[in-house]
C-alpha cells in the first residue's frame, strides 16, 4: 500500500535534514527569500494560482516514482545533516505553493533550479494534475527561455533543494494522514 511505498522512499535524504517536525516561524536568514502562502495560492503576475483542486494522488505518484530520485541525485555527495529545514507547509495546497515557489522563483544566490530535471518534472506534474495550471505558465515559459542556462550547483542551491525535499516529504505525510 501507500505506506509501504513511502517507507521504501525513506533513503538518506528523506530521513535527514531537520527531522520530522517543521518550524512554522519565518525563514531566518536562509538563502531563499520568498513569502509563505499558507492559503495554497501562488502569485502569478496579477493573479494567484490555487492548488486546492489538484489531483494530489497523481502528483504523489509522480513524485515517488521519479521526481524524488532526481532531487536525491542532485543532492548526491552531501549529508542529510548538512542543512536545516527552515521552510514548512501545513496542508497539501500549501505544500505545493511552497514547492512551486522554491523550484521556480529564481533567487540572487540560486538562479538555476528551473532548468534541472526535477524542476522540469515538477512543472509537468503540476501542469497535468492541477486544473488550469498550464495556462498560468504560458507567459512564465517565455521568461524562463530567456533565463541563463547556468548549470553551476552552488551550496545555496543545495540548501534550497534540501528544503524542497523536506516540503515534498511533508506533502506525502499530509497525504498519508488522509488515507
Amino acid at each position: 500500500g501507500l505506506n509501504d511505498i513511502f517507507e521504501a522512499q525513506k533513503i538518506e535524504w528523506h530521513e535527514g535534514g531537520g527531522g520530522s517536525d517543521y518550524k512554522d516561524d519565518d525563514d531566518k536568514g536562509s538563502s531563499h527569500h520568498h513569502h509563505h502562502h499558507s492559503s495554497g495560492l501562488v502569485p502569478r503576475g496579477s493573479h494567484m494560482y490555487d492548488f486546492t483542486n489538484c489531483d494530489f494522488q497523481k502528483i504523489e505518484a509522480d513524485y515517488l516514482r521519479t521526481i524524488s530520485k532526481d532531487l536525491i541525485t542532485y543532492m548526491s555527495g552531501t549529508k542529510s545533516t548538512d542543512f536545516n529545514n527552515t521552510v514548512s507547509c501545513s496542508n497539501r495546497p500549501h505544500c505545493l505553493t511552497e514547492i512551486q515557489s522554491l523550484t521556480f522563483n529564481p533567487t540572487p544566490r540560486c538562479a538555476s533550479l528551473a532548468k534541472e530535471m526535477f524542476a522540469r518534472k515538477t512543472k509537468a506534474t503540476l501542469a497535468l494534475w492541477c486544473p488550469g495550471y498550464s495556462e498560468t505558465q504560458i507567459n512564465a515559459t517565455q521568461a524562463m527561455k530567456k533565463a541563463r542556462k547556468s548549470k553551476v550547483t552552488t551550496n545555496k542551491c543545495l540548501e534550497q533543494v534540501s528544503q524542497l525535499l523536506g516540503l515534498w516529504r511533508r506533502f506525502i505525510r499530509t497525504l498519508l494522514k488522509k488515507q
Epitope: 497523481k58 509522480d62 501542469a127 497535468l128 486544473p131 488550469g132 498550464s134 527561455k145
Partner: antibody, heavy 120, light 107 residues
C-alpha cells in the same frame, strides 16, 4: 521539422486487439506527452488518453479504461496505443498528437491518422 | 467531465464574410480552450491556443477570445480554404474533451 508518422490501416475481427504506432521525429520526445484521439466515421473527436514519457505515466478516458493501453519506447521515440476487445463501434481513425508538458501545453502536431476497421 | 457545446452546428457563409463560432463550457475553465480546423481526410490543425494565443503560420484572420465558460473563434474574412469543420477543446482538466464541431460551408 516535427513529424508524427503513424502505422498503416488495420482490419480486425470483433473481440481481437489492435496496436497502432506513432513514430516521432524533429523534437525532443520526452518534452512532450503523446495523446491519442479517435474519430468515428462522420463523428466528432474523442480523447482516449495520453502517455507522458518525462514522468513515465499515463492517463485514460474512463470510456476506454481497461481496454486501451498507451505506452512509449523512448529509445525509438515511438508511442503505441493498443485497444483490446474490439467491437464494430471501434471502427474509427485513430490519431496521435503531441502536447508540451513543460511549455506550450497544447496538441500542436498530429499524426496522419490510422484507420482501424472492425468487421466480422 | 467538462462538456463543450459548439454553436451553430453549421454556418453557411460566402467568401469574404465574417464567421463567428461559439464554444460554451459546462463549467469554468479559465482560458484553457484551443481551436482546431479539420478538413475531410485530414488530421486536425491547431489554430488558436489558450483562448486567444496565436500560432505562427496561421493567418491573422483567425482570432480567439473569451474566458470562463464562453469562447469565440472569429474568422474576419473567409477565404475558400477556410471552409471546414472547427472544433474547440479544453485542457483545463482530464479527461480532455472536444466540442461536437461547427461546419463552415459555402453558401
Amino acid at each position: 521539422q516535427v513529424q508524427l508518422v503513424q502505422s498503416g490501416p488495420e482490419v480486425k475481427k470483433p473481440g481481437s486487439s489492435v496496436k497502432v504506432s506513432c513514430k516521432a521525429s524533429g523534437y525532443i520526445f520526452t518534452d512532450y506527452a503523446m495523446h491519442w484521439v479517435r474519430q468515428r466515421p462522420g463523428q466528432d473527436l474523442e480523447w482516449m488518453g495520453t502517455f507522458i514519457p518525462l514522468l513515465d505515466t499515463s492517463d485514460y478516458n474512463q470510456n476506454f479504461k481497461g481496454r486501451a493501453t498507451i505506452t512509449a519506447d523512448k529509445s525509438t521515440s515511438t508511442a503505441y496505443m493498443e485497444l483490446s476487445s474490439l467491437r464494430s463501434e471501434d471502427t474509427a481513425v485513430y490519431y496521435c498528437a503531441r502536447m508540451g508538458v513543460t511549455h506550450s501545453y497544447v496538441m500542436d502536431a498530429w499524426g496522419q491518422g490510422t484507420l482501424v476497421t472492425v468487421s466480422s | 467531465e467538462i462538456v463543450l457545446t459548439q454553436s451553430p452546428g453549421t454556418l453557411s457563409l460566402s467568401p469574404g464574410e465574417r464567421a463567428t463560432l461559439s464554444c460554451r463550457a459546462s463549467q469554468h475553465i479559465s482560458r484553457s480552450v484551443h481551436w482546431y480546423q479539420q478538413k475531410p481526410g485530414e488530421a486536425p490543425r491547431l489554430l488558436i491556443y489558450f483562448a486567444s494565443q496565436s500560432i505562427s503560420g496561421i493567418p491573422d484572420r483567425f482570432s480567439g477570445s473569451g474566458s470562463g465558460t464562453d469562447f469565440t473563434l472569429t474568422i474576419s474574412r473567409l477565404e475558400s480554404e477556410d471552409f471546414a469543420v472547427y472544433y474547440c477543446q479544453q485542457s483545463y482538466s482530464f479527461p480532455y474533451t472536444f466540442g461536437r464541431g461547427t461546419k463552415v460551408e459555402i453558401k
